[in-house]
């Protein structure tokens, strides 16, 4: 906290210029005024003030609006942004797409701080839903920012704003977060043809069930291995090793590779031995001829 | 943010001359206003010396001007700070930086510029 001084003879801030990086933390407090810096905020970002004088404007500006700023400051804060407080923020009322974008350019190129992810809540939860600019707007700062949300937070993504999603955003999702975004994507390209579609769906396609991996089998698209690593283990058993075989088309041959991790150990497990042994790869663990298998799951159903 | 890397500092004379060097590699080094500041032991670390981008705009502290000299040069991302005719008030450690490594409190290890008879 800085002492209340008298602004020294011929201090007084006129204007908001690089002369004021030279005064001292106390003649900050004594010789800038408060509603001049809100008026000239857009000054600041351009002057190398030190991280302890920032402090000071900033503690001018609390005082000006002990309520919250303005969104007319917000948007001009700047490098003042990095001295908020999630509190503070919480304060605020970003609505403006233009404001949150000039705020996320102060960190862009550092990880989501507190703060960041305070204003980014704050906007959405203004907005009522995570709208297609919105989306663009975050995703572009944040690559994994969708999959920082919880799959209840998920649920407010229109399925418009899935065209806004790249791959590399749903990189580090977790199945249930997948399993609430694929239905959306896949209403949100539902009218594009098979080749097209399967290019935007794939990247989402951890959350699809077994039927819709089985009707893909029949359109001839080669699906990678990376992809079929990451789809659900218990969409993925209940495939037969022809559907299988459809799904992969070339990429088939890389099933051998992965055969002891997940989901490809437990389909194997699931497989007659025979029909693994069409495939040529040498997969070993499949059910031994003449054995029997029971679902024990669709026994317990029906008692 | 990349941190700066000054150099030039050492133990002069009242009266004396030093040239500090300030590279900042990584960053856009045009995009921002640079400068000098200082801190000796105790003290608030104070603005001494500001560039702007363009290197058209200078501003000295009051107790430099005359005696200091900044400079930018942008092909080799490098700031300089020309000091002539120093004195004992001006020892301390020397640090460059940019506005938004100032406002991160990311700072170079500075150079010690010691003046002493």
């Known amino acids: 906290e800085v002492e209340k001084t008298a602004c020294p003879s011929g201090k007084k801030a006129r204007e908001i210029d690089e002369s004021l990086i030279f005064y001292k933390k106390w003649e900050l407090e004594a010789c800038v005024d408060a509603a001049l810096l809100a008026t000239q905020m857009d000054r600041v970002n351009a002057i190398p003030f030190t991280y302890e004088q920032l402090d000071v404007l900033k503690h001018k500006l609390d005082e000006l609006y002990p309520q919250g700023y303005p969104e007319s400051v917000i948007q001009h804060l700047g490098y003042l942004f990095l001295k908020m407080s999630p509190e503070d923020i919480r304060k605020w009322n970003v609505t403006s797409l233009e404001t949150l974008k000039a705020l996320l350019e102060v960190n862009k190129g550092h990880e989501m701080s507190p703060q960041v992810a305070t204003l980014i809540d704050r906007f959405v939860k203004g907005r009522g839903q995570l709208d297609k600019d919105t989306l663009d707007t975050l995703t572009a700062f944040y690559p994994g920012y969708l999959c920082s949300l919880s799959p209840e937070e998920l649920s407010s993504v229109p399925p418009s704003s899935i065209w806004a999603v790249r791959p590399q955003d749903l990189d580090t999702c977790d199945p249930r977060q997948l399993d609430v975004l694929y239905p959306k994507a896949r209403l949100a390209f539902q009218n594009m043809n098979g080749s097209e579609y399967f290019v935007k769906i794939q990247s989402f396609l951890g959350g699809a069930p077994t039927e819709d991996l089985k009707a893909l089998s029949q359109q001839n698209v080669s699906m990678d291995l990376a992809t079929f690593m990451k789809l659900r283990t218990d969409a993925v058993l209940p495939l037969t090793v022809a559907e299988v075989q459809k799904l992969l088309g070339p990429h088939v041959e890389g099933l051998k590779a992965e055969e002891r991790h997940r989901p490809v150990r437990d389909w194997i497990l699931r497989q007659r031995q025979d029909d693994l042994d069409t495939l040529g790869l040498g997969l070993q663990g499949g059910i031994p001829n003449g054995y029997l298998v029971l679902d024990l799951s669709m026994q317990e159903a029906l008692s | 943010q990349v941190q700066p890397v000054e150099s030039g500092g050492g133990l002069v004379q009242p009266g004396g001359s030093l040239r500090l060097s300030c590279v900042v590699s990584g960053s856009d080094f045009t995009e921002d206003a640079m400068a000098w500041y200082r801190q000796a032991s105790g003290k608030e670390r104070e603005s001494v010396a500001f560039?702007?981008?363009?290197?058209?705009?200078?501003l000295y502290l009051d107790s430099v001007r005359g005696r200091f000299t900044i400079s930018r040069d942008i092909y080799k991302k490098t700031v300089y700070l020309q000091m002539d005719n120093l004195k004992p008030e001006d020892t301390g450690v020397y640090y460059c930086n940019s506005a938004p490594g100032a406002a991160r409190n990311v700072w170079g290890q500075g150079t010690q510029v010691t003046v002493s008879s």
């Open positions: 560039v702007s981008k363009d290197g058209k705009r200078i």
